[in-house]
């Protein structure tokens, strides 16, 4: 088992994740593990010396950086909120606040916007990941309705009048529920047609 530092004529190292090629000395040196940085560079006789990232800084990967990255907050004004704190090994984890989606992305979400309302008769298509994109409104399926303009309202099944011992007075639509009435109630004049034999 060859341990760093070791010479490399072809400029490649055995373990690409944990080692790097140092061209000045033509050697392979150890990278520093996550949560640390290079405090002393390697030489032909000595491997890389690593030190732990200071508070409020981090390095996520095996690296040969001479500094740690500064932890950044999740700015509420940008629609972001924190879901996990920054550690020496991981940046602050942010997400869009409820009812929002990521509107600007640069390696990570930088700005969120409010989800669009879905009009009556529709609902937002369910997404694999919350906050990833704006609402895509789809019509309520048969036998369902949704009667508000809302980013999050779901289509509900039409009421089944017979389940409540009632009869249907008016059928449900995509935007309204079924109207029920008591069987004993007489129909309004416009609905009671006279049947002539």
């Amino acid at each position: 088992q060859v341990v760093p530092p070791y010479g490399s004529e072809n400029q490649t190292c055995r373990d690409q994740e944990k080692e790097y090629y140092e061209p000045r000395h033509r050697i392979c040196c150890s990278r520093c593990p996550p949560g640390t940085y290079v405090s002393a560079k390697c030489s032909r006789s000595r491997d890389t010396v690593c030190a732990t990232c200071a508070e409020n800084s981090y390095n996520e990967h095996w690296n040969y950086l001479t500094i740690c990255q500064l932890c950044r907050p999740c700015d509420p004004v940008m629609g972001l909120e924190e879901i996990a704190p920054c550690t020496s090994k991981r940046k602050t984890q942010c997400r869009c606040q409820p009812g929002m989606f990521c509107a600007a992305w640069a390696l990570e979400c930088t700005h969120c916007e409010l989800l669009s309302d879905c009009p009556p008769g529709t609902e937002a298509e369910l997404k694999d990941e919350v906050g990833k994109g704006n609402n895509h409104c789809v019509p309520c399926k048969a036998g369902h309705f949704q009667n508000t303009s809302s980013p999050s309202a779901r289509c509900q099944p039409h009421t089944r009048c017979e389940d409540q011992g009632l009869v249907e007075a008016a059928p449900g639509t995509a935007q309204s529920d079924t109207t029920c009435r008591n069987p004993s109630e007489s129909l309004p004049p416009e609905m009671s047609g006279t049947m002539l034999m």
Epitope: C74, P76, V77, E81, I83, Q97, P98, G99, C112
Partner: nanobody, 112 residues
Framework: EVQLVESGGGLVQPGGSLRLSCKAS????????FGWYRQAPGKQRELVAT???????WYDVSVKGRFIISRDNPENTVYLQMNSLRPEDTAVYYC??????WGQGTLVTVSS
């Protein structure tokens, strides 16, 4: 449109304490994360503390261990408890959230 009104600032001696309040209106309060920001004379506004909808908190290194951010959802209010105040904490303090209008802020002066 979200309106925010900050209060509770004043003149305090080094080592003293203050509690800032921020009353919000025009938003579903419990669905919003909030931040306390400050702007010292001649400097840029900086974020000092945040609180998420779930109550997770973040603090800038300069105030960690001294300031405590909290929220009262029924009262639509966010607080900033400031302890062990230092002269360098002197600034106008603002609270804000998504689509919030920057309020007048509240002036905190730490001086003997």
């Amino acid at each position: 449109e979200v309106q925010l009104v900050e209060s509770g600032g004043g003149l305090v001696q080094p080592g003293g304490s203050l509690r800032l309040s921020c009353k919000a209106s025009g938003t579903t309060f419990s669905d919003r994360a909030f931040g306390w920001y400050r702007q010292a004379p001649g400097k840029q506004r900086e974020l000092v503390a945040t609180i998420s909808t779930a109550g997770l908190t973040w603090y800038d290194v300069s105030v960690k261990g001294r300031f405590i951010i909290s929220r009262d959802n029924p009262e639509n209010t966010v607080y900033l408890q400031m302890n062990s105040l230092r002269p360098e904490d002197t600034a106008v303090y603002y609270c804000n959230t998504f689509r919030g209008n920057w309020g007048q802020g509240t002036l905190v002066t730490v001086s003997s």
